[in-house]
Each structure stands twice: as structure tokens, then as C-alpha cells.
């Protein structure tokens, strides 16, 4: 699987799970949120070549297709499988709420 | 939908069902196969900027983390939603079978 | 259900200023990613700016020309175009993305027209 465990002890060109940060307030201008203060999105990057982590058989046959043909633009890409809610505690005026986000956090990658 | 009833009458850089003919023979080397000679692929690609069909709350997050932060290299990514199979014929001997392969034709794009 | 109302457009000389507003409904507002959109004809729809909480981002094209700024107390969002062009006729969407709530989702305006032409 294209997830933490494997991706993050790896350097990888190829599609595989990347760490990424996201800081509500800064990297968002998201002040409204109290708790988290950021999380841990990750997100999913890299190349797709033949039979990497294929999602269906169309993108089999598309990175097939591309590696016979590489003149082709044509080829899967790198995009998240797995996903995790976020729970976050805002105010509506002073009343607390807590919320879950659903498929916030990527947890594993596939080529599609 | 990003299908071709929008993609294929709209010249669209952002993401969109693109059309793509396979000849099996010559694109993948099936001799194999009977039954068709090839079939309309199709696959996705463009880019997926802020809100554009975006799937899930993380590809909006991230679409907006992106456009936030240019220099940033996480963004949503252009890939397949709606995918149909295609009826193939080919010879095991001198025997028939007619075949049904899943996910093989490419009907709608997401940004994912 | 979430009510994004645009107003503002209309005609106007290259090198004049128009301010476009979209209102939105209050009980989201203080939370929602407020942006502006445009489809000019025959073109792909495409961002113009983004107020998200405090932070303001424009496209390439209307850098140092627009401005986006937001009152959370009147629960609207304005875009002020300064020396307009030409090609910045289009008819301008403002757009809710609401992150969280029962109302969670985007929201679109109907359009207003902005026509640059002498």
C-alpha cells in the first residue's frame, strides 16, 4: 500500500503518500477554527508508470498505452485512496461546536 | 459532469474527459483480441484549480491551500469517475468467449 | 440552503472602476471562503480573487488592479475593479464554499455582467 508506513521510510519518484502540514490560520487564513490549529493533510504526488499501484483496468491499459507510446500525453495519475475524517471544535458566537470533516486526511495513494 | 456532453463541445485547459482511441493491435500489441479492433478509451486531463469539480472536502482543501500558495506543489490531480466495461470476443483454441472487462471506458472526470 | 446574490455590474470605459458586491447568508459567512469568478464567452470559467478568513489571493491578470475585501457585519464580499480592460468583460460569479455546518458545501450566485468597452 501507497501509505505512510511504506512512502515516508522511501524516497519515491513514483506515486506514493507526501507529508504535508496545513496551519489553519496561515496557510488558510481559517482563524474560525479553535482546535486543531492545523493537521496532518498529506497529499498524493508522483509518477504513474506501468502497473504501479494500477486503480482499474482502464488505468492498466493507459499506462500500458503510455509506456508503448510515450509520445502519448495520455496517463494515470497519482491521487488519494484512503481518507480519514478531521474533528475540529468552532463558535457559532460563543457556543462551542465540535464537527467532523469526513475525507480530510489522506492516508494511502493509487495510480487511476 | 465533466463528460462528453460538456468536454468534448467546450475547449477546456481544466480538467475534462478527453477522447483517446485504443487499436489493440497497434497501440498494445493484442493480437488477441477478436472482437472489437480497438474502443474509445477516453482519459482525463487538465489542470483542477479552485473548486473545479472538486471530490472531496481534502482535493477542495488542498485546491485552496494551492491557490493560496503558489509556490506549493500539492494539488488535486485529474482522474477518472464514472467508468463502463467493454464486451470483448476472443480464442482460447478454437473456442469463443465473449468477455466482459470492468472499468475499462473512461465516461467522466473529478478532480481528486 | 445558503443564498449568494451578486450586484454591481454594467457598463464601463477601459480605464474605469466598477465595485461589484455578493451578499451571503449570515449564518455562514463568518466561515465561508468567499470568491470571485468569471466567464468571459466562449472561454473556461476562472478564479479572479479569494478572501479566505484573512488571507486575499488574485489571479495573475487582475494583480494590483482588484481588490477583494470582506464585511463580516454586513455579510458581503466586494470586488473593487480599478483600471478595467477590455478583456476583463465577463460575467462575474461570487461563490460560497462553506467548509463546515449542515449548510456545508458551495454556493453559486446567478452573475452579474461587467462590460468593458469604449
Known amino acids: 500500500a501507497l501509505d505512510a508506513a511504506y512512502c515516508f521510510r522511501n524516497v519515491q519518484d513514483n506515486c506514493c503518500l507526501r507529508p504535508l502540514y496545513i496551519d489553519f490560520k496561515r496557510d488558510l487564513g481559517w482563524k474560525w477554527i479553535h482546535e486543531p490549529k492545523g493537521y496532518n493533510a498529506n497529499f498524493c504526488a508522483g509518477a504513474c508508470p506501468y502497473l504501479w499501484s494500477s486503480d482499474t483496468q482502464h488505468s492498466r491499459v493507459l499506462s500500458l498505452y503510455n509506456t508503448i507510446n510515450p509520445e502519448a500525453s495520455a496517463s494515470p495519475c497519482c491521487v488519494s485512496q484512503d481518507l480519514e475524517p478531521l474533528t475540529i471544535l468552532y463558535y457559532i458566537g460563543k457556543t462551542p461546536k465540535i464537527e467532523q470533516l469526513s475525507n480530510m486526511i489522506v492516508k494511502s495513494c493509487k495510480c487511476s | 459532469a465533466l463528460d462528453a456532453a460538456y468536454c468534448f463541445r467546450n475547449v477546456q485547459d481544466n480538467c475534462c474527459l478527453r477522447p483517446l482511441y485504443i487499436d489493440f493491435k497497434r497501440d498494445l500489441g493484442w493480437k488477441w483480441i477478436h472482437e472489437p479492433k480497438g474502443y474509445n478509451a477516453n482519459f482525463c486531463a487538465g489542470a483542477c484549480p479552485y473548486l473545479w469539480s472538486s471530490d472531496t472536502q481534502h482535493s477542495r482543501v488542498l485546491s485552496l491551500y494551492n491557490t493560496i500558495n503558489p509556490e506549493a506543489s500539492a494539488s488535486p490531480c485529474c482522474v477518472s469517475q464514472d467508468l463502463e466495461p467493454l464486451t470483448i470476443l476472443y480464442y482460447i483454441g478454437k473456442t469463443p468467449k465473449i468477455e466482459q472487462l470492468s472499468n475499462m471506458i473512461v465516461k467522466s472526470c473529478k478532480c481528486s | 440552503e445558503v443564498q449568494v446574490v451578486e450586484s454591481g455590474g454594467g457598463l464601463v470605459q477601459p480605464g474605469g472602476s466598477l465595485r461589484l458586491s455578493c451578499a451571503a447568508s449570515a449564518s455562514v459567512f463568518s466561515w465561508s471562503v468567499m470568491g470571485w469568478f468569471r466567464q468571459a464567452p466562449g472561454k473556461q470559467r476562472e478564479l479572479v480573487a479569494i478572501?479566505?478568513?484573512?488571507?486575499?489571493t488574485y489571479a495573475d491578470s487582475v494583480k494590483g488592479r482588484f481588490t477583494i475585501s470582506r464585511d463580516n457585519a454586513k455579510n458581503t464580499v466586494y470586488l473593487q475593479m480599478d483600471t478595467l480592460k477590455p478583456e476583463d468583460t465577463a460575467v462575474y460569479f461570487c461563490n460560497a464554499y462553506v467548509p463546515v455546518g449542515e449548510s456545508r458545501g458551495d454556493y453559486w450566485g446567478q452573475g452579474t455582467q461587467v462590460t468593458v468597452s469604449s
Open positions: 478572501s479566505s478568513g484573512d488571507r486575499e
